[in-house]
Interface confidence: low
C-alpha cells in the first residue's frame, strides 16, 4: 500500500493586509478515513485554525467541498488577513478514533502579512530658533507590519546621526508605529534647507517613503544693521542710510527716530530674496541740516519677527554748516517713492 502523502506545495505565501490568503493542501489518498485539520505552529502549543470535521471558523472557508467523498483537496482560504495571522500553517491528516490520531503533517506553509507604513509626517518646532541653536524634528508613520523597519534622517541630502527612534508596541501586535526625533543644529545658511525622514519597509519594494520639513519654518536669521551718512548735498540735505541685511523671515518693521522722536515707520514687503533665502532692505532719511541748531541723533530701529527691537544710532554734525533763517523743518522726505531702496546684494 502506498504511503499517505500530505502535500503543501508552497513553502511560503505573502499576503497584503486585508486580502485573502489561500493555503493549499492535497492528500495522496483518502485511506484511512479521518479528518484533516489546519494548525498554526507545531508542537503541543499549536493553534487549531480549521477543522473540516466540526467547529465554526468564520474567517476560514474550504476551497473545495470537503464533504465530497472523492475530494482530495483540503486547501483553505483565510479572509481579511491581518498581521496577527502571520505564522507557519500545517495541514494535518488524522485517523478517525477516540481521540483522532495524527497520521501525517504537511511540510508547512509560512504566511507572512504585509501592511504598508503610512506616509511619514514630519513636524518641526513650534517656535523659530536662531543659528547655532538645536531644534527637534519629529517623524511619525503608522500601521505597518512586519515590525522591522528602517528610518533615516537627511539634511540637504546628508544623513543625520543625532536622532532617537522608537517602534511601538514592543511586543507582538496587529500593526506597528514608528516615531523618531532628530536634533538639527541651525546655521544662518539654512533658510533653504530641508530635513527628510525616510522610511524603508519590506512592503515598499525598495522605494522608501519620505516626509519633509523646511527649515524655513523653524529658523530666524536676525538682521545686521549699518547706518551711514552720504555726502552733503548742495541743498544742505544729508542722506542717512540704514542698511538691514541678511534677515529671515521677511516680517520686519523699521522706524526712524530723530533725537528720540519717531520720524517714520515702514514695513518690509515684497522684498527680493538673496541666494541664501535671506532678505536685505535699505531705507534712507533726508535730513535738512540748515533746520537744526544742534547735532541730530538719528536712530534706525528694527523690529524683526516679533523680537525685541534692535537700534543703531548715528549723529549728524550740523555745527559746521550755515543755518538757514526762518526754517522750522526738522526733517524732510523726498517722496514715498524714495523712502526705500531695495538692496540687491546676494
Amino acid at each position: 500500500e502506498e504511503e499517505l502523502q500530505v502535500i503543501q506545495p508552497e513553502k511560503s505565501v505573502s499576503v497584503a493586509a486585508g486580502d485573502s490568503a489561500t493555503l493549499n493542501c492535497t492528500v495522496s489518498s483518502l485511506i484511512p478515513v479521518g479528518p484533516i485539520q489546519w494548525f498554526r505552529g507545531a508542537g503541543p502549543g499549536r493553534e487549531l485554525i480549521y477543522n473540516l470535521k466540526e467547529g465554526h471558523f468564520p474567517r476560514v472557508t474550504p476551497v473545495s467541498d470537503p464533504t465530497k467523498r472523492n475530494n482530495m483537496d483540503f486547501s483553505i482560504r483565510i479572509s481579511n488577513i491581518t498581521p496577527a495571522d502571520a505564522g507557519t500553517y500545517y495541514c494535518v491528516k488524522f485517523r478517525k478514533g477516540s481521540p483522532d490520531v495524527e497520521l501525517k503533517s504537511g511540510a508547512g506553509t509560512e504566511l507572512s502579512v504585509r501592511a504598508k507604513p503610512s506616509a511619514p509626517v514630519v513636524s518641526g518646532p513650534a517656535v523659530r530658533a536662531t543659528a547655532e541653536h538645536t531644534v527637534s524634528f519629529t517623524c511619525e508613520s503608522h500601521g505597518f507590519s512586519p515590525r522591522d523597519i528602517t528610518l533615516k534622517w537627511f539634511k540637504n541630502g546628508n544623513e543625520l546621526s543625532d536622532f532617537q527612534t522608537n517602534v511601538d508596541p514592543a511586543g507582538k501586535s496587529v500593526s506597528y508605529s514608528i516615531r523618531s526625533t532628530a536634533r538639527v543644529v541651525l546655521t544662518r545658511r539654512d533658510v533653504h534647507s530641508q530635513v527628510i525622514c525616510e522610511v524603508a519597509h519590506v512592503t515598499l519594494q525598495g522605494d522608501p517613503l519620505r516626509g519633509t520639513a523646511n527649515l524655513s519654518e523653524a529658523i530666524r536669521v536676525p538682521p545686521f544693521l549699518e547706518v551711514t551718512q552720504q555726502s552733503m548735498r548742495a541743498d544742505n540735505q544729508v542722506n542717512v542710510t540704514c542698511q538691514v541685511t541678511k534677515f529671515y523671515p521677511q516680517r520686519l518693521q523699521l522706524t526712524w527716530l530723530e533725537n528720540g522722536n519717531v520720524s517714520r515707520t515702514e514695513m518690509a514687503s515684497a522684498l527680493p530674496e538673496n541666494k541664501d533665502g535671506t532678505y536685505n532692505w535699505t531705507s534712507w532719511l533726508l535730513v535738512n541740516v540748515s533746520a537744526h541748531r544742534d547735532d541730530v541723533k538719528l536712530t534706525c530701529q528694527v523690529e524683526h519677527d516679533g523680537q525685541p527691537a534692535v537700534n543703531k544710532s548715528f549723529s549728524v554734525k550740523v555745527s559746521a554748516h550755515p543755518k538757514e533763517q526762518g526754517s522750522n523743518t526738522a526733517a524732510e522726505n523726498t517722496g514715498t517713492n524714495e523712502r526705500n531702496i531695495y538692496g540687491g546684494s546676494g
Epitope: 502549543g45 487549531l48 468564520p58
Partner: antibody, heavy 118, light 107 residues
Framework: EVQLVESGGGLVQPGGSLRLSCAAS????????MHWVRQAPGKGLEWVSA???????YYTGSVKGRFTISRENAKNSLYLQMNSLRAADTAVYYC????????????WGQGTMVTVSS | DIQMTQSPSSLSASVGDRVTITCRAS??????LAWFQQKPGKAPKSLIY???SLHSGVPSKFSGSGSGTDFTLTISSLQPEDFATYYC?????????FGQGTKLEIK
C-alpha cells in the same frame, strides 16, 4: 461536559496572599489560551491575566508584579497566585477559556469571591 | 490600552421590542469584538465573537455587526429572560478590555 470550576477565594487582609484554582473538565486546558477576569461588587468586568498555549503570560497593569498566572497540565488546572493584595482587588474572579480560533472567550466558570479587608 | 465605550449605559424596553446596543473602540480592532450577557449573581455568558458569529446554543434573535471601531448588538424580539446587563469586549490585543456595560431593564 465542558466546565470550569474556580476555588480558593475568601477573606484576606491587605498585603496578604491568596491562590485561586480553576479545574477544567471536558477539554484539555493546555490546548487553549486561558484567562482570569474579575468583577468588583456592583462594577463591570475587568480582564486580569492570560496564559497562552506556549506558556506566555499577560497581565493588566494594576496587577503586574503582584499576580502570577500558571497552569498544571497534569491536573488540567489553571492558577492565579495573588500577592500584596489591596482593597481594590476585592472582586469575583472568573476563570475563562479562550476560543481555539481567535481567543474569543467561550466558557466561563461560576466565579470565586475574593475580599481584601482588614 | 484600547478603550471600549458602550451606549446607552441603561435602556428600558418592553417585551417584544427590538433593541440595539452600540460599542465603540478607541482604535481599529478589525472584527475582534465579543458580546456577553450577565444576569445578577451569575457568571457572564458568551453570546457573540468576531463581531457577528454566534456561540453555540445562542438563539438567533441575537445578532452582531460592525468592523473597525463601531459595533452593534441587536436583540430582535425581547423576551423576559433577555433583561440583563450586556458587555462588549475587544480581544485584538492585550490588555483585553470591556465596555462599561449596558443595563437592559423592563419598561
Amino acid at each position: 461536559e465542558v466546565q470550569l470550576v474556580e476555588s480558593g477565594g475568601g477573606l484576606v487582609q491587605p498585603g496578604g496572599s491568596l491562590r485561586l484554582s480553576c479545574a477544567a473538565s471536558g477539554f484539555t486546558l493546555s490546548s487553549y489560551d486561558m484567562h482570569w477576569v474579575r468583577q468588583a461588587p456592583g462594577k463591570g468586568l475587568e480582564w486580569v491575566s492570560a496564559i497562552g498555549t506556549a506558556g506566555d503570560t499577560y497581565y493588566t497593569g494594576s496587577v503586574k508584579g503582584r499576580f502570577t498566572i500558571s497552569r498544571e497540565n497534569a491536573k488540567n488546572s489553571l492558577y492565579l497566585q495573588m500577592n500584596s493584595l489591596r482593597a481594590a482587588d476585592t472582586a469575583v474572579y472568573y476563570c475563562v477559556r479562550g476560543g481555539v480560533w481567535d481567543d474569543a472567550f467561550d466558557i466561563w466558570g461560576q466565579g470565586t469571591m475574593v475580599t481584601v479587608s482588614s | 490600552d484600547i478603550q471600549m465605550t458602550q451606549s446607552p449605559s441603561s435602556l428600558s424596553a418592553s417585551v417584544g421590542d427590538r433593541v440595539t446596543i452600540t460599542c465603540r473602540a478607541s482604535q481599529d480592532i478589525n472584527n475582534y469584538l465579543a458580546w456577553f450577557q450577565q444576569k445578577p449573581g451569575k457568571a457572564p455568558k458568551s453570546l457573540i465573537y468576531t463581531a457577528s458569529s454566534l456561540h453555540s446554543g445562542v438563539p438567533s434573535k441575537f445578532s452582531g455587526s460592525g468592523s473597525g471601531t463601531d459595533f452593534t448588538l441587536t436583540i430582535s424580539s425581547l423576551q423576559p429572560e433577555d433583561f440583563a446587563t450586556y458587555y462588549c469586549q475587544q480581544y485584538v490585543s492585550y490588555p483585553y478590555t470591556f465596555g462599561q456595560g449596558t443595563k437592559l431593564e423592563i419598561k
